[in-house]
Amino acid sequence: DITPSVPPASYHPKPWLGAQPATVVTPGVNVTLRCRAPQPAWRFGLFKPGEIAPLLFRDVSSELAEFFLEEVTPAQGGIYRCCYRRPDWGPGVWSQPSDVLELLVTEELPRPSLVALPGPVVGPGANVSLRCAGRLRNMSFVLYREGVAAPLQYRHSAQPWADFTLLGARAPGTYSCYYHTPSAPYVLSQRSEVLVISWEGEGPEARPASSAPGMQAPGPPPSDPGAQAPSLSSFRPRGLVLQPLLPQTQDSWDPAPPPSDPGV
């Protein structure tokens, strides 16, 4: 039973492998990998590429097996697959492996890029699209504008990027974006470098992110990892802090006034 012999394609259909609370987590979080077979199984195996023997076994007479990874470290990140088998199959015969699940354990997601399409110079009456591009799919992207405390726009994207459209008349300004996991426990990216959008005839000016007034690096996620992403008004702002935010719509937010802070 140690070395699985994989049967011919589609002989025993593959199971599904998922992660709770998420596939991208910070170190120290408890992660459960759940392998679900399309039929009741008898034994489940969790595999990592390059390893002949399963990393973990679960003998469960059910369609579901859970593998617990306690207080994960970055070293436990990587690619996982699972298989299942039944006692009435031949010795060592396992199902097709699940699709890969990539577990990423990191304190911070890589910095996204922010570019203007077609370019950072806006002609009269023309709109401009800002693309915030990270490296991971299914993330929530947030666009900020210097001088506006609330996020300018918010997008959840299945792609590793999100496009934000700015109306020409209101486009000129200094922008920054970041992205984060769509649900708790939140993992935030570094903030992009700022992008200056200017009118035709004024040269765009590149500035390093650190010098952008009124914009700070992302702050920590909310203290309760089980909570939904809060709105900015539900915690104390420190200058402008980039936080995971729950959008009012899936597409975008209108600019909002800065949150009131009665405790100040």
Partner: antibody, heavy 121, light 106 residues
Amino acid sequence: QVQLQQSGAELARPGASVKLSCKASGYTFTDNYINWVKQRTGQGLEWIGEIYPGSGNTYYNEKFKGKATLTADKSSSTAYMQLSSLTSEDSAVYFCARSANRYDRGDFDYWGQGTPLTVSS
Amino acid sequence: QILLTQSPAIMSASPGEKVTMTCSASSSVSYMHWYQQKPGSSPKPWIYDTSNLASGFPARFSGSGSGTSYSLIISSMEAEDAATYYCHQRSSYPYTFGGGTKLEIK
């Protein structure tokens, strides 16, 4: 959209055999188990067995072994159930149903309209 | 085999009333599924994986439970909810259904 279209009502003599069909459309037939469920008039639901059309693998309720035989024809995306040595106890409505087979869903997500079978001399 | 026992077998409720029906399994199951069936029709997937409402169905329905004890709840009964509800497990062969709860409108 996903559809399971079952064959029409059957009338059969005791001791005879009958073959019911379930034609699938709107999805890849070989990706999901097809289940068969029996319901006698005014009674509950009883699982007969399932077939994985991708391989032809079958799993039966012990109660129906020898009574039901499940097959599938990939070329026509049709699942079949043959019932043999019929008795009045086999008079019922027979449903085919697709297993959802998703990480986040494991019920029978689509059902055929049912085939009534009457066994009578 | 896992025996699923539904209770009550028959019940009636007035419009607006809260309705709770239960399904007890003889052994632990990972998930419970629920179907609604009306006379002359196929069963309809109603709640899957214990607590997920199938798309297009009213939010007044909810499901909960774990292990051997599961429930289907209607927060406010409506006339169209009158039907028979079956619980169902796929955690162990043979797959089994409960005997059904017939819900009538008062």
